[in-house]
């Protein structure tokens, strides 16, 4: 009788994670007597996957009827495959003895595991940035196999080109991770913009995974200020408004200064939203001109989103509003605490 051969017909087998892998092995002879064992890897560190003789291998089942001696098929099925199962599997015939001795090994079957990438996670900068600045976004996805993968960046549907991508590790591994950094130039219109990271992989059957970041989390649009004097409401009153325009996010505090002294502080509440996602707000101040002998410098000072304050001033000419003969303000007459500046917002 010819010497036993161990035949592993498949050089490689590719299986999707979660599925079962069938590894084929047949022997050409019934002798010598002794068990078949399956190993992953070769050499002294090889890992026992299945032993016909003994042991508990809950994920492994024999494919054919193993209770008949004439059975020479020692193929196995490994259930619930994960990327960690990737490797070369060897079917090995042992000769019965004390100890059992390796008689002959098959050529090996390389098992590769197709594992889907995790949903891409896009993260932006830790601090907000203003228009015209360039910010970096990162995209990460893990656990995929094989290594080949495609990553694209988009801003509002337009593909970006300024990005760098790495797939790790560089060498052989059971699974891989991708890390990409894209540079995006912010514009004032980006409050409603989205940055999208798109990952395509063989396991996704043409339906790529996407991760998104809203630029509203990243952008800060500083306000423009305009202080205007409205027509007088009464002969001795002037209405001064501070228009705070095109700002984002909404967090804003406004302080009125009269000749450098704080007159009133308020927080933006009833704002109006522009189409581009920025906000407008208006604050007004009613100034009793008759309370002032000299010109008044009114300053609208805005602190937006914790940034250094910006301000706009308006000079109110008192001389332009002559007082009536003998009609001094109550404050001047009585020295009372009655306020001479009134304000509001809208």
């Amino acid at each position: 009788e010819e010497e036993l051969q161990v035949i592993q017909p498949d050089k490689s087998v590719s299986v999707a994670a979660g599925e079962s892998a069938i590894l084929h092995c047949t022997v050409t002879s019934l002798i010598p007597v002794g068990p078949i064992q399956w190993f992953r890897g070769a050499g002294p560190a090889r890992e026992l996957i299945y032993n016909q003789k003994e042991g508990h291998f809950p994920r492994v089942t024999t494919v054919s009827e193993s209770t008949k001696r004439e059975n020479m098929d020692f193929s196995i099925s490994i259930s619930n495959i994960t990327p960690a199962d990737a490797g070369t599997y060897y079917c090995v015939k042992f000769r019965k003895g004390s100890p059992d001795t390796e008689f002959k090994s098959g050529a090996g079957t390389e098992l590769s595991v197709r594992a889907k990438p995790s949903a891409p996670v896009v993260s932006g900068p830790a601090a907000r940035a203003t228009p015209q600045h360039t910010v970096s976004f990162t995209c990460e996805s893990h656990g995929f196999s094989p290594r080949d993968i495609t990553l694209k960046w988009f801003k509002n549907g337009n593909e970006l080109s300024d990005f760098q991508t790495n797939v790790d590790p560089v060498g052989e591994s059971v699974s891989y991770s991708i890390h990409s950094t894209a540079k995006v130039v912010l514009t004032r219109e980006d409050v409603h913009s989205q940055v999208i990271c798109e990952v395509a992989h063989v396991t996704l059957q043409g339906d790529p995974l996407r991760g998104t970041a809203n630029l509203s989390e990243t952008i800060r649009v500083p306000p423009t200020l305009e202080v205007t004097q409205q027509p007088v409401r009464a002969e001795n009153q002037v209405n001064v408004t501070c228009q705070v325009r095109k700002f984002y996010p909404q967090r804003l505090q406004l302080t009125w200064l009269e000749n450098g002294n704080v007159s009133r502080t308020e927080t933006a509440s009833t704002v109006t939203e522009n189409k581009d996602g920025t906000y407008n707000w208006m604050s007004w101040l009613l100034v009793n001109v008759s309370a002032h002998r000299d010109d008044v410098k009114l300053t609208c000072q805005v602190e937006h989103d914790g940034q250094p304050a910006v301000s706009k001033s308006h000079d109110l000419k008192v001389s332009a509003h002559p007082k009536e003969q003998g009609s001094n303000t109550a404050a001047e007459n009585t020295g009372s605490n009655e306020r001479n500046i009134y304000g509001g917002s809208g």
């Epitope: 009788e1 002879s29 019934l30 002798i31 007597v33 002794g34 068990p35 078949i36 016909q52 003789k53 003994e54 193993s66 209770t67 008949k68 001696r69 004439e70 059975n71 019965k96 003895g97 004390s98 100890p99 059992d100």
Partner: antibody
């Protein structure tokens, strides 16, 4: 059903011969290592002989040169030719099938009695 | 030849008892040890192979253990039908050899 049935036992004089047969059913005998085991009256079990799937044969020391194990695939049968019989060969002879991969005994026949006496 | 020494040669026990029979090989036999049960006038019945694997149809009250030279057969809860003679065997190399047997009797 997997079964082994021995036959051919009986009374024989010392120096005489006997041929035991074992008919197998429910499996292909040639695919298994097959054995003969005996048990002298009131004694324990003693392995006697074996034949491998390649026709290789093995014997316990006390029967070497006197007993011959063989099989006939067409009849799915195992045989033990016993020559130069001695009183010490008196025993029940069992035909036994070796296991699928390790030759562990799994199926036993009911046995046939061989008595060597003058 | 490899000798198989079984102990005890006889054992008295009661129904419900847990009993253990041991077998020692004169040299290492890996785990190629088998156990058989034989009742008077009957052919032996295969119980255990490769030291701890149960043959098909053998109740789980029978268990085996060991490797190398020392092996045990344990019957967890004796029933009347378990009173018989038990043999160990090595089948790592020819000539295959049996222990002398342990006769398990009702106390």
């Amino acid at each position: 059903e997997v079964q082994l049935v021995e036959s051919g036992g009986g009374l024989v004089q010392p120096g005489g011969s006997l041929r035991l047969s074992c008919a197998a059913s429910g499996f292909t005998l040639s695919s298994y290592d097959m054995h003969w085991v005996r048990q002298a009256p009131g004694k324990g079990l003693e392995w006697v002989s074996a034949i491998g799937t390649a026709g290789d044969t093995y014997y316990t020391g006390s029967v070497k040169g006197r007993f011959t194990i063989s099989r006939e695939n067409a009849k799915n049968s195992l045989y033990l030719q016993m020559n130069s019989l001695r009183a010490s060969d008196t025993a029940v002879y069992y035909c036994v099938r070796g296991g699928v991969w390790d030759d562990a005994f799994d199926i036993w026949g009911q046995g046939t009695m061989v008595t060597v006496s003058s | 030849d490899i000798q198989m020494t079984q102990s005890p040669s006889s054992l008295s026990a009661s129904v419900g008892d847990r009993v253990t029979i041991t077998c020692r090989a004169s040299q290492g036999i890996n785990n190629y040890a088998a156990w058989f049960q034989q009742k008077p006038g009957k052919a032996p019945k295969s119980l255990i192979y490769t030291a701890s694997s149960l043959h098909s149809g053998v109740p789980s009250k029978f268990s085996g253990s060991g490797s190398g030279t020392d092996f045990t057969l344990t019957i967890s809860s004796l029933q009347p039908e378990d009173f018989a003679t038990y043999y160990c065997q090595q089948y790592v190399s020819y000539p295959y050899t049996f222990g002398q047997g342990t006769k398990l009797e009702i106390k």
